[in-house]
Interface confidence: medium
């Protein structure tokens, strides 16, 4: 009998509100034994797959997708899914990335604290979305 795959979680570092031109890293987490993580961008039906999976803890694996310089077009909903042979997991909850103009004021923090979306139940459409051009170093600039 095949094991039930737990839903992945998604988080953003350093947070979900990112100043224009700053960096953000999406972190997808799942159980050990994950072969491929996929970061999906909902609004444009794009995604990227990576096998660059590391062990985050004895019971968790993770993959990191970095955007070096956030643009307005990067704002939107993101979610994770993973492949653990021989099947795909359900999608994670959505995480919304907000991009703001850099004000530079001393009272305005650059980012909100790290935010995550765990395995809370919500409808998912299970559609396979578009691959986008890839580059070395797990960059996710193309997810916009």
């Amino acid at each position: 009998q095949e094991e039930d795959l737990p839903r992945p979680s998604i988080s953003a570092e350093p947070g979900t509100v990112i100043p224009l031109g700053s960096h953000v890293t999406f972190v997808c987490r799942g159980p050990v034994g994950v072969q491929t993580f996929r970061l999906e961008r909902d609004s444009r039906s794009t995604y990227n797959d990576t096998e660059d999976v590391s062990q985050a803890s004895p019971s968790e694996s993770e993959a990191r997708f970095r955007i070096d310089s956030v643009r307005e077009g990067n704002a939107g909903l993101y979610r994770c899914i993973y492949y653990k042979p021989p099947k795909w997991s359900e999608q994670s909850d959505y995480l919304e990335l907000l991009v703001k103009e850099s004000s530079g004021g001393p009272d305005s923090p650059d980012t909100e604290p790290g935010s995550s979306a765990g395995p809370t139940q919500r409808p998912s459409d299970n559609s396979h979305n578009e691959h986008a051009p890839a580059s070395q170093g797990l960059k996710a600039e193309h997810l916009y």
């Epitope: 990227n48 797959d49 990576t50 660059d52 396979h128 578009e130 691959h131 051009p133 890839a134 580059s135």
Partner: antibody, heavy 120, light 110 residues
Amino acid sequence: SSSVEESGGRLVTPGTPLTLTCTVSGFSLSSYVMGWVRQAPGKGLEWIGTISIRSNTYYASWAKGRFTISKTSTTVDLKITSPITEDTATYFCARGAGNVYYSDYYFSLWGPGTLVTISS
Amino acid sequence: ELVMTQPPASVSAAVGGTVTINCQASQNIYSNLAWYQQRPGQPPKLLIYKASTLASGVPSRFKGSGSGTDYTLTITDLECADAATYYCQTYYNMMDDGAAFGGGTEVEIK
């Protein structure tokens, strides 16, 4: 410059296992996925399988169980486990365009091919 | 199983003319499509990837287009050297016959 070259193609009898080797130069197998594609005489291209930088392997449904792809630091092997006459073809080794993203799994660099003949 | 269909098997056109080659996927492959040129006795050569991006060194006479399940390779200002067989290939989902080729279309230059 980067190159790939296949070797090991020869005439074998049906059922005799055969291993083809792809030797790469000018780039590292830790940075690129690699694939095997074959072409029967006068026919089209057939994808057999791909091996990732993490040595995960992906096969065409018709090739599962019939072929095994593996690699070392400088070579990629294709083993035909129990050849049949229909496996007679030129076998190409090809380099993917990148590494961990599936969107880089098209083939940007090809070897000249090696001819395999299966006949009794 | 992902199947790539590439009709017709052959097409003929004159030097200086234009030829259009079609490729259809059995499911949405979201522009994860490459085109290759293969001349007799040679290995394939990458022309286009991501449905419309020209590979390095490929003349702009070659143009890829399409989305969803339907894709097209258009060659304009045909030259004698363009006589070859052209293949489409997807690299959509590696878990499901993800790198299937079309059957090929032979281009004859009159």
